[in-house]
């Protein structure tokens, strides 16, 4: 669809005569008839297949034609067509004399014709005017013409209809050839697909309007490139949604069980060495001079009873000093000036001469020790009780009184709150520092998994398109992890992939 435009510029008929040579009376009141038709090698009369148009009287004899885009005397003249412009044409322009006001062909005498010109040729669609001048013996006509496309028609022959739009059926303007030119932020055959925020993850993000990045289930962040870990994950990370991969030193389903108490809490004092011995469990190896579960107690050097033979120990800044009883000497009163004749063995110990009577040795009865059997045996000196247990002498034996949470001969065993299987319905028991925690199977809840709740949310296979279903243990709901190309809470929506 387009318009053939003809702009009449000047008509010269100096003598004011008709084509027959007869003069007009009083002058030639001139109007024009235009016939546009298909290309003919020799332009002949016949139907004006591309259209006709007539002007009112534009002047007398010789005159210039003003541009006029309004009223009946439109100039340029418009010859609209509703077909593909063929690129060729024939044009007939007739100048007529109007003796009266009726310009209809049937109202005019045939000899009222002033001049007739006919041209034909090629004409491409375009904005530029082609100027032409046709001269006969008595008249001259100067004019220009062009073909332009109607509004919303494009292309070399005005055959492509294109209307700019900005709604959900397209966001585009039209190029000169009629192809669509997408508005910024849109793409696709009809410019109906938004271009997401730059960097928005191809699989894990999508958008419904330009420069947006909406995350698929299981993903988060401005560009939807961060996975969402399992609900309740404490000291863990994920590489795919709903994972909980524990950080070093942590364990359990939610990575909330401390496997590296030594590093996280540094419980051992006074330079002691800490060893992890299980979940929230550790052992401190004390440096000399310290004791206690956490080596928090400073030992007196006299506590180890270094003075022998009844010597008394005195603490000093740089150690200790033994005050020996009569008959003994040495750093620890270990040397005796006595012999068996002096009856040095106490508590029924028997004396044996040594080195030809220069020395002796006592053989002590049970429960006594020391070079003179002067000490009652203390079976607790070696600190045999672990985990802060208290050592008690019981005659010839000893026993450990354990702190709560520990058992065994030497309090070496951690009492498990889980030992009595407190979690019902197959719940998994986790020992905590102050009690226990049950992780319940799907369908059960409560502190001990004693409450029956809804069945496994994934049991009904709610996820579509081969998505992976995860049950959220804390809410008894499911989450679908969609494969590439699908979105939606159940992965039910395919995504138009580029």
């Amino acid at each position: 669809s387009g318009v053939f435009q003809l702009q009449l510029q000047e008509f010269i008929n100096e003598r004011g005569v008709l084509a027959s040579g007869r003069p007009c009376e009083p002058g030639c009141r001139t109007f024009f008839r235009v016939c546009l038709k298909h290309f003919q090698a020799v332009v002949s009369p016949g139907p004006c297949t591309f259209g006709t148009v007539s002007t009112p009287v534009l002047g007398t004899n010789s005159f210039a034609v003003r541009d006029d885009s309004s009223g009946g005397g439109r100039n340029p003249l418009q010859l609209p067509f509703n077909f593909t412009w063929p690129g060729t044409f024939s044009l007939i322009i007739e100048a007529w004399h109007a003796p009266g006001d009726d310009l209809r062909p049937e109202a005019l005498p045939p000899d009222a014709l002033i001049s007739k010109i006919a041209i034909q040729g090629s004409l491409a669609v375009g904005q530029n005017w082609l100027l032409d001048e046709q001269t006969s013996t008595l008249t001259r006509l100067r004019y220009s013409y062009r073909v332009i496309c109607s509004d919303n028609y494009y292309g070399d022959n005005c055959s492509r209809l294109c209307k700019k739009r900005n709604d959900h059926f397209g966001h585009y303007v039209c190029q000169p050839d009629g192809n669509l030119s997408c508005l910024p932020g849109w793409t696709g055959e009809y410019c109906q697909q938004p271009i997401c925020l730059s960097g928005c993850h191809e699989q894990n993000g999508y958008c419904s309007k330009p420069a947006e990045c909406l995350c698929r289930p299981g993903w988060q962040g401005r560009l939807c490139n961060e996975c969402i870990p399992h609900n309740g994950c404490r000291h863990g990370t994920c590489s795919t949604p709903w994972q909980c991969t524990c950080d070093e030193g942590w364990g359990g389903l939610f990575c909330d069980q401390d496997l590296n108490y030594c590093t996280h809490h540094s419980p051992c004092k006074n330079g002691a060495t800490c060893s992890n011995s299980g979940q929230r469990s550790y052992t401190c190896t004390c440096r000399p001079g310290y004791t206690g579960v956490d080596c928090e107690l400073e030992l007196s050097e006299c506590d180890s009873n270094p003075c022998r033979n009844g010597g008394s120990c005195k603490d000093q800044e740089d150690g200790y000093h033994c005050l020996c009883p009569p008959g003994y000497y040495g750093l620890h009163c270990e040397h005796s000036t006595l012999s068996c004749a002096d009856s040095p063995c106490f508590n029924g110990g028997s004396c044996r001469e040594r080195n030809q009577g220069a020395n002796y040795a006592c053989e002590c009865p049970p429960n006594f020790t020391g070079s003179n059997c002067e000490k009652k045996v203390d079976r607790c000196t070696s600190n045999p009780c672990a985990n802060g247990g208290q050592c008690l002498n019981r005659g010839p034996s000893r026993m450990c009184r354990c702190r709560p949470g520990f058992t065994g001969t030497y309090c070496e065993l951690h009492v498990s709150d889980c030992a009595r299987n407190p979690c019902a319905h197959g719940g998994t028991c986790h020992d905590l520092e102050n009690g226990l925690m049950c992780t319940c199977p799907a369908g059960f809840s409560g502190r001990r998994c004693e409450v029956r709740t809804s069945i496994d949310a994934c049991a009904s296979s709610p996820c579509f398109n081969r998505a992976t279903c995860y049950t959220d243990l804390s809410t008894d709901t499911f989450v679908c992890n969609c494969p590439y190309g699908f979105v939606g809470s159940r992965c039910e929506f395919p995504v138009g992939l580029p």
Epitope: H168, P494, G496
Partner: antibody
Framework: EVQLVESGGGLVQPGRSLRLSCAVS??????????WGWIRQAPGKGLEWIGD???????YYNPSLKSRVTISVDTAKNSFYLQMNSLRAEDTAVYYC?????????????WGQGTLVTVSS | DYQLTQSPSSLSASVGDRVTITCSGQ??????ASWYQQKPGKSPKLVIY???KRPSGIPSRFSGSNSGDDATLTISSLQPEDVATYYC?????????FGQGTKVEIK
């Protein structure tokens, strides 16, 4: 050949809700070339566009009905739906579902047979 | 709200007559117009889209045009099977708008 079949019509009391289904067969609702729309026609009256949806879930609604209408899609079932709340007598109409083609400037080239909804106590 | 007004609202013509229905709306020529035919008790059927294009199966006697504020549907030679109500439709931003319809009958 693509066919659209509506279901869910019938008698509804004023103030209640309605959910209509449109099952698409012979073609995929996930095609990027179409929007899927709902149009209604009150008895003896003209056509009124309600809204439409793209397979991705993007929706567009007639402003005069937007507050009461929700359109959804289930690509797995190759169906789309119209939920309408707070029904009143003037919502009595034949409800059509239709396929709107991008290649046809949004013209609806396929229509369902329609389902009658009567709102009355 | 954008409105489309069809004229006439009804017409009666003889078989073989040329029938023209007009649909008017502000700057309608800048939008794509569609035309639908609805026979009594039936669903609407698309007869013209994008102003002047015919879907496959629609007879060539149906034609359309659209410029300025008016779109027209022309049936060049009315046939008995063309008895129906005809609706124009266009999109205003993201909203579909229909004309009120023109009922075509045979004299």
């Amino acid at each position: 050949e693509v066919q659209l079949v509506e279901s869910g019509g019938g008698l509804v009391q004023p103030g209640r809700s309605l959910r209509l289904s449109c099952a698409v067969s012979g073609g995929s609702i996930s095609s990027s070339s179409y929007y899927w729309g709902w149009i209604r026609q009150a008895p003896g009256k003209g056509l009124e566009w309600i809204g439409d949806i793209y397979y991705t879930g993007s929706t567009y609604y007639n402003p005069s009905l937007k507050s009461r209408v929700t359109i959804s899609v289930d690509t797995a079932k190759n169906s789309f739906y119209l939920q309408m709340n707070s029904l009143r007598a003037e919502d009595t109409a034949v409800y059509y579902c239709a396929r709107q083609a991008l290649a046809m400037g949004g013209g609806s080239d396929k229509w369902g047979q329609g389902t009658l909804v009567t709102v009355s106590s | 709200d954008y409105q489309l007004t069809q004229s006439p609202s009804s017409l009666s013509a003889s078989v073989g007559d040329r029938v023209t229905i007009t649909c008017s709306g502000q700057r309608l020529g800048d939008k794509y117009a569609s035309w639908y035919q609805q026979k009594p008790g039936k669903s609407p059927k698309l007869v013209i889209y994008e102003d002047s294009k015919r879907p496959s199966g629609i007879p060539s006697r149906f034609s359309g045009s659209n410029s300025g504020d008016d779109a027209t549907l022309t049936i060049s030679s009315l046939q008995p099977e063309d008895v129906a109500t005809y609706y124009c439709q266009a999109w205003d931003r993201d909203t579909g708008v229909f004309g009120q319809g023109t009922k075509v009958e045979i004299k």
